[in-house]
């Protein structure tokens, strides 16, 4: 029986060009974590395997860094990074737990400030 719960950072926002840490935490279970997958919509970003450590998908190698812990750091954020992110915990004997994070990437405050106070 699956007794665990996944706590996530929930809905978060970050500035364009900056970085953000995606974090999930599995609690209330003694199940052994085999692997944690990080996905953006349906694209696999990274895997943290209990045996073998981290594997970052080649297409994200430049902008994704492993950690801290089982979390994932996204760097050089663009507006296109806005969307849903999922942490998928493969555990034994429980099975698969999924957590969801929504990231909104905002134009930097400098850009917003400049846009608001344009001289006609």
């Amino acid at each position: 029986m699956m007794t665990g719960t996944i706590e996530t950072t929930g809905n978060i926002s970050a500035e364009k060009g900056g970085s953000i840490i995606l974090q999930c935490h599995l609690s209330s279970t003694t199940a052994q974590v085999t692997q944690v997958n990080w996905e953006q919509q349906d694209q696999l970003l990274a895997i943290c395997n209990a045996d073998l450590g981290w594997h970052i998908s080649p297409s994200f190698k430049d902008r994704v860094a492993p950690g801290p812990g089982l979390g994932l750091t996204l760097q050089s954020l663009t507006v296109n990074d806005t969307g849903e992110y999922f942490c998928i915990y493969h555990t034994y004997p429980d099975g698969t737990y999924t957590g969801r994070i929504f990231l909104e990437v905002l134009e930097s405050s400098v850009a917003e400030h400049g846009a608001r106070f344009q001289i006609p």
């Epitope: 699956m2 052994q32 085999t34 692997q35 997958n37 349906d42 696999l44 895997i47 395997n49 209990a50 045996d51 073998l52 594997h55 493969h90 034994y92 004997p93 429980d94 099975g95 698969t96 999924t98």
Partner: antibody, heavy 119, light 107 residues
Framework: EVQLVESGGGLVQPGGSLRLSCAAS????????MSWVRQAPGKGLEWVAT????????YYADSVKGRFTISRDNSKNTLYLQMNSLRAEDTAVYYC????????????WGQGTLVTVSS | DIQMTQSPSSLSASVGDRVTITCRAS??????LSWYQQKPGKAPKLLIY???KSHTGVPSRFSGSGSGTDFTLTISSLQPEDFATYYC?????????FGQGTKLEIK
């Protein structure tokens, strides 16, 4: 090209032992979770056991727990299934299978090896 | 254990037909469902994973859908090589159970 070739099947008496092997090629064997799945004659598929890439973690179906041992030798690119205290209901074709890196499904399977438990 | 029930158990169809096979889980399995094709005397082949993702090299006529407890595998236009047995498998919780299979035969 990914290839998985099982061997070691045969006829064994109830209570006997058998060791199955699965020789892997065409991929980085040590990076992938592997499993054994069996299929009794004319029946469906049954998951038997799984082992992590480094061999640290092993998982078993209740029907084989305590009797079967899954292991791997990454230096030889080979997966094993040691089967002890065999029963008639263990009669099946045994397949080794490689999981996707994501661990979402078994993407390649061997051709299978038949194990017959009979007196 | 999660029980996986496929329907129908067998199905007769003709080349060119559109065919749908359903798989029902005894409890919520989110999208953790795979579909496999098996021909007599051969090993299973992965068609679909994560309910709707096509495995590399699988013809586009095969598609999967569903989430929660109800899933479908659709073959849009049957080809002669598609006559086989199809299995669903859940990856939500151990043991990772399979459906009993659907045998697709030539009408």
């Amino acid at each position: 090209e990914v290839q998985l070739v099982e061997s070691g099947g045969g006829l064994v008496q109830p209570g006997g032992s058998l060791r199955l092997s699965c020789a892997a090629s065409g991929f980085t064997f040590s990076s992938y979770i592997m499993s054994w799945v069996r299929q009794a004659p004319g029946k469906g598929l049954e998951w038997v056991a799984t082992i992590s890439g480094g061999g640290t973690n092993t998982y078993y179906a209740d029907s084989v727990k305590g009797r079967f041992t899954i292991s791997r030798d990454n230096s030889k690119n080979t997966l094993y299934l040691q089967m002890n205290s065999l029963r008639a209901e263990d009669t099946a074709v045994y397949y080794c299978a490689k999981w996707l890196l994501s661990y979402y499904a078994m993407d390649y399977w061997g051709q299978g090896t038949l194990v017959t438990v009979s007196s | 254990d999660i029980q996986m029930t496929q329907s129908p158990s067998s199905l007769s169809a003709s080349v060119g037909d559109r065919v749908t096979i359903t798989c029902r889980a005894s409890q919520n399995i989110n999208v953790w469902l795979s579909w496999y094709q098996q021909k007599p005397g051969k090993a299973p082949k992965l068609l679909i994973y994560k309910a709707s993702k096509s495995h590399t090299g699988v013809p586009s006529r095969f598609s999967g859908s569903g989430s929660g407890t109800d899933f479908t595998l659709t073959i849009s236009s049957l080809q002669p090589e598609d006559f086989a047995t199809y299995y669903c498998q859940q990856g939500q919780s151990y043991p990772y159970t399979f459906g009993q299979g659907t045998k697709l035969e030539i009408k």
